[in-house]
């Protein structure tokens, strides 16, 4: 074979969002007949030469970026896409509210607001879907998520997290659910697909005004000004519905 071996995939099961003290399994998957796997935590000196890492109880310092590769003969593969393992429940849950209220007319505007008692500068909002209700959220630097020109597709259950950019993999417990009801339409609310494309963007300009729209059942972000965004790979495998257990600090 010429050139490097193709990269393996790295998954966190059941999810890459892991409540403190709950189990998670990291699984590196290459082609059949691999001689050796190496799974490593970035920005640390730790690695293991096995394809599966079972974490029986999630801890704060296990959160972070992971990647894996494999060896066949003397050849090493390209590294997998990075997996971002997030510890949730590190901080008390924020509160999620809708302004002017959780019931909104089709065509109207609503803003979802995530509030925390900590001085955190980052927030994550996600919508419960079906059949896998808990999806990787998209992140913004603002606590307010305006939804302009609401449609039936925006109906559903939302939760948010708060966290600090100083420790981007240590998140709060999820907020209590907020049910957004869109009135004046009989269209069935759309669901997120089992594994949406994940154009998760980290925005480097904290003051950018963001408009959240859910077009074609996929989370997207739009902004009215030029901001720097770097797309990241999706790090949540498709799978059965995920149960989240939350724990305050």
């Amino acid at each position: 074979q010429s050139g490097p071996l193709p990269k393996p995939s790295l998954q966190a099961l059941p999810s890459s969002l892991v409540p403190l003290e709950k189990p998670v399994t990291l699984r590196c998957q290459g082609p059949p007949g691999v001689d050796l796997y190496r799974l490593e935590k970035l920005s640390s000196s730790r690695y293991q030469d096995q394809a599966v890492l079972f974490i029986p109880a999630m801890k704060r310092s296990l959160a972070g970026r992971y990647r894996c590769s494999y060896q066949n003969g003397s050849l090493w593969s390209l590294p997998s896409d990075q997996l971002e393992l997030v510890a949730t429940g590190v901080f008390a849950k924020p509160s999620l509210s809708a302004q002017p209220g959780p019931a909104v007319s089709s065509g109207g505007d609503v803003t979802l607001q995530c509030q925390t008692r900590y001085g955190f500068d980052q927030f994550a909002l996600y919508k419960e879907g079906d059949p896998a209700p808990y999806k990787n959220p998209e992140r913004w630097y603002r606590a307010s998520f305006p939804i302009i020109t609401v449609t039936a597709a925006h109906s559903g259950t939302y939760r948010c997290y708060s966290f600090s950019s100083r420790d981007p993999y240590l998140w709060s417990a999820p907020s209590d659910p907020l049910e957004l009801v869109v009135t004046g339409t009989s269209v069935t609310p759309s669901r997120l697909p089992t594994e949406p494309p994940s154009p998760v963007a980290e925005f480097s300009e904290a003051t950018a005004e963001l408009t959240v729209s859910f077009t074609n059942e996929v989370f997207t972000t739009e902004t009215s000004r030029s901001i720097t965004a770097s797309p990241k790979e999706s790090d949540s495998p498709a799978g059965p519905a995920r149960q989240y257990y939350t724990k305050g600090n």
């Epitope: 920005s43 310092s61 296990l62 100083r166 240590l170």
Partner: antibody, heavy 116, light 96 residues
Framework: EVKLQESGGGLVQPGRSLKLSCTAS????????MSWVRQAPTRGLEWVAS????????YWRDSVKGRFTISRDNAKSALYLQMDSLRSEDTATYFC?????????WGQGVMVAVSS | LLSASVGDRVTLNCTAS??????LAWYQQKLGEAPRLLLY??NSQTGIPSRFSGSGSGPDFTLTISSLQPEDVASYFC????????FGAGTKLELK
């Protein structure tokens, strides 16, 4: 070479305060959780407190909660332990250590004696 | 306290009060020095001499020194980090 150097120990009366410092070198300090561990002849090794790499999350053993505060300054590669309302049972050698779960590097330790 | 001779195979045991999976570390501490990490995750080495090895999972763990050397005289501690973070009382190893 990884080095951790504690300072700030000494003899103090019960109820008084003391601040320990730990200066780190030889590794990227901001990448690692850091902890304080203490050792007393009567009680052996005891984990005291840990702080996340960015400093947003910190936590303590129950017996020091509300009295001790762990903090860090990544720009200075420094770790601190502010100890207030000291008690005789806090008498021990205090070690600065790298990590949260297991501790792969330790300082040489600094003695704290609480006595009237 | 454990006494052994140079060249002996020495086994130290550590039993946790519950299943801690492989969340266990072993440390060596020589007199007047700080502890030194020998093994983490029950059996993962940290650049120590190959005569040190670890085994076990659940509540029962073992640290083995395959051939005792004079410089191995020290106290040895196990530490679990599955539920909180606690150290064993330690075993002092001396030469016969």
């Amino acid at each position: 070479e990884v080095k951790l150097q504690e300072s700030g120990g000494g003899l103090v009366q019960p109820g008084r305060s003391l601040k320990l410092s730990c200066t780190a070198s030889g590794f990227t300090f901001s990448d690692y959780f850091m902890s304080w561990v203490r050792q007393a002849p009567t009680r052996g090794l005891e984990w005291v407190a840990s702080i996340s790499s960015g400093g947003a999350s910190a936590y303590w053993r129950d017996s020091v909660k509300g009295r001790f505060t762990i903090s860090r300054d990544n720009a200075k590669s420094a770790l601190y332990l502010q100890m207030d309302s000291l008690r005789s049972e806090d008498t021990a050698t205090y070690f600065c250590a790298r990590g949260e779960l297991d501790f792969d590097y330790w300082g040489q330790g600094v003695m704290v004696a609480v006595s009237s | 306290l454990l006494s052994a001779s140079v060249g002996d195979r020495v086994t130290l045991n550590c039993t946790a009060s519950q299943n801690v999976y492989k969340n266990l570390a072993w440390y060596q501490q020589k007199l007047g020095e700080a502890p030194r990490l020998l093994l983490y995750s029950a059996n993962s080495q940290t650049g120590i001499p190959s005569r040190f090895s670890g085994s076990g999972s659940g509540p029962d763990f073992t640290l083995t020194i395959s051939s005792l050397q004079p410089e191995d005289v020290a106290s040895y501690f196990c530490q679990q980090y599955y539920s909180g973070n606690t150290f064993g009382a330690g075993t002092k190893l001396e030469l016969k």
